[in-house]
Interface confidence: low
């Protein structure tokens, strides 16, 4: 008598979730005469698929006829695959007993199921930096199997590589989760600039999945000041101006002081925009010479989206301005740097 | 502080060469090192920039021969495919352009491409 | 890809001259100021002497300056000194971050 064998020509079967498994398996006898039972995993703690002979299985179909003659076919169909769905099934003959008595099994056919990863999350850092500073971006995407996964982030269309990637579990499960953080250095043109945390996998079909932030959420660009004084009108009244530029977030208070007393505080808003996201403020002085008889130290404090303030400072000569109309006074810069970096 | 090249020499057409650009007296790891050629008799031109970590960027003609990375001493630039119009004095430079402007500069390092 | 135009090519000027030398984009450089001008004498170095179109480099003699925004950018020297004598080259940024061209050079020599 020729020794019966189980085949399962299938090692492993790949399905997307959503869709049926066609889990295949032919005997190469029908001696002995007895059941043929699907099970996921081997052993005692195996669980029971589908079982020709009896039970009730809604997601489980033949794929023929198990009640025709001569059939040695007994693959199965599993509808509306999930994650959860993964193994390695066994195909198993039994021989007629009371109980039936398991007499040979397949080699086994390992289903994974595509999962495809949720929408990439990407999370910035909690506090602005400056230009020549590090900060780490986070990308999260979920749910999706096998585990093989790539993800690539992007800077204004340029792949970073200070990157550190984790998927997890490292062992075998229904679906894994990948983290990876991206530290980008801050550039001060990085206004406008994106990153992006781009997913592929193979259920995406070569259409990766993306995931974006603006480093307009995590930059600060603290501004340049400039003072500069304009001559001397009629009236003997002087226009200094107090020049913010190049600053980001629009987030700015300005404040004058005549000889250390303030005389206005303003709050920037509704501010153009420079072609590279930044802004520029201007804010306006006009000093009476001749309500003073000595020289006038005027201060540009400007506190920028929550930092120190940064003071320019210098004086207006009251005896560089005769009663009549002067010319212009290079005001005498007594200031801070004009670049201030915080 | 000065930054001090090393590496150049002579090497045929399509060979390879590592250039090193050492630091002294500073750090490299808050600046980029940007690397700058010079032709014999010619002008300077702009190679390209190791930022800061390990963000690199080379002008377009430079992109896939050349390449770089950087620790917090030592910044290294790779050339490949060399041709003899690759022949030059190799510069680096601290700083990255615009308000890191290139400062100070190594005195350079000859490559030669010759068969 | 920007590109940077100097001229003239080469001047003759002797020791006490006002000297002017021009560099051009062929595009508004990044910020309107990008742009910075580098000193190189023969068998040496570059060295910086102006950046951000108008700013004198740490250590640079005043008798250097900057000007211009946007395309058009000027160095000069109000009284050349004998160490003057040298080659300048400007070097602007385009929007890009690679986007760094240096222009053909100026040799400033002794008339």
């Known amino acids: 008598e020729e020794e019966l064998q189980v085949i399962q020509p299938e090692k492993s079967v790949s399905v997307a979730a959503g869709d049926s498994a066609t889990l295949n398996c032919t005997v190469s006898s029908l001696i002995p005469v007895g059941p043929i039972q699907w099970f996921r995993g081997a052993g005692p703690g195996r669980e029971l698929i589908y079982n020709l002979k009896e039970g009730h299985f809604p997601r489980v179909t033949p794929v023929s006829d198990p009640t025709k003659r001569n059939n040695m076919d007994f693959s199965i169909r599993i509808s509306n695959i999930t994650p959860a769905d993964a193994g390695t099934y066994y195909c198993v003959k039994f021989r007629k007993g009371s109980p039936d008595v398991e007499l040979k099994s397949g080699a086994g056919t390992e289903l994974s199921v595509r999962a495809k990863p949720s929408a990439p999350v990407v999370s910035g850092p909690a506090v602005r930096a400056t230009a020549e500073h590090t900060v780490s971006f986070t990308c999260e995407s979920h749910g999706f199997s096998p585990r093989d996964i790539t993800l690539k982030w992007f800077k204004n269309g340029n792949e970073l590589s200070d990157v550190q990637t984790n998927v997890d579990p490292a062992g075998k499960s229904v679906s894994y989760s990948i983290r990876s953080t991206a530290r980008v250095v801050l550039t001060r043109r990085d206004v406008h600039s994106q990153v992006i945390c781009e997913v592929a996998h193979v259920t995406l079909q070569g259409d990766p999945l993306r995931g974006t932030a603006n480093l307009s959420e995590a930059i600060r660009v603290p501004p340049f000041l400039e003072v500069t004084q304009q001559s001397m009108r009629a009236d003997n009244q002087v226009n200094v101006t107090c020049q913010v530029t190049k600053f980001y977030p629009q987030r700015l208070q300005l404040t004058w002081l005549e000889n250390g007393n303030v005389s206005r505080t303003e709050m920037a808003s509704a501010l153009p925009e420079n072609k590279d996201g930044t802004y520029n403020w201007t804010s306006w002085l006009l000093v009476n010479v001749s309500a003073h008889r000595d020289d006038v130290k005027l201060t540009c404090q400007v506190e920028h989206d929550g930092q120190p303030a940064v003071n320019k400072s210098f004086s207006v000569k009251v005896s560089a301005h005769p009663k009549e109309q002067g010319s212009n006074t290079a005001a005498e810069n007594t200031g801070t740097n004009e670049r201030n970096i915080y | 502080r000065q930054l001090v090249e090393s590496g150049g020499g002579l090497v045929q057409p399509g060979g390879s060469l590592r250039l090193s650009c050492t630091a002294s007296?500073?750090?490299?790891?808050?600046?980029?090192i940007s690397w700058v050629r010079q032709a014999p008799g010619k002008g300077l031109e702009y190679i390209g920039t190791?930022?800061?970590?390990?963000i690199t960027y080379f002008a377009s003609w430079a992109k896939g021969r050349f390449t770089g990375s950087k620790t917090s001493s030592t910044a290294y630039m790779e050339l490949s495919s060399l041709r003899s119009e690759d022949t030059a004095v190799y510069f680096c430079?601290?700083?990255?352009?615009?308000?890191?402007?290139?400062?100070?500069w190594g005195q350079g390092t000859l490559v030669t491409v010759s068969s | 890809d920007i590109e940077m135009t100097q001229s003239p090519s080469s001047v003759s000027a002797s020791v006490g001259d006002r000297v002017t030398l021009t560099c051009q984009a062929s595009?508004?450089?990044?910020?309107?100021?990008?742009l910075a001008w580098y000193q190189q004498k023969p068998g040496q170095a570059p060295k910086l002497l102006i950046y951000?179109?108008?700013t004198l480099a740490t250590g640079v003699p005043s008798r250097f300056s900057g000007s211009g925004s946007g395309t058009d950018f000027t160095l000069t020297i109000s009284s050349l000194q004998p160490e003057d004598f040298a080659t300048y080259y400007c070097l602007g940024g385009g929007d890009d971050e690679a986007d760094n061209v240096f222009g053909g050079g100026t040799k400033v020599e002794i008339k």
């Open positions: 430079a601290r700083g990255s352009a615009w308000n890191d402007p290139f400062d100070p």
């Open positions: 190791i930022g800061t970590g390990v």
């Open positions: 595009q508004s450089v990044y910020g309107n100021n990008d």
């Open positions: 951000l179109a108008s």
């Open positions: 007296g500073f750090s490299l790891s808050s600046h980029g």
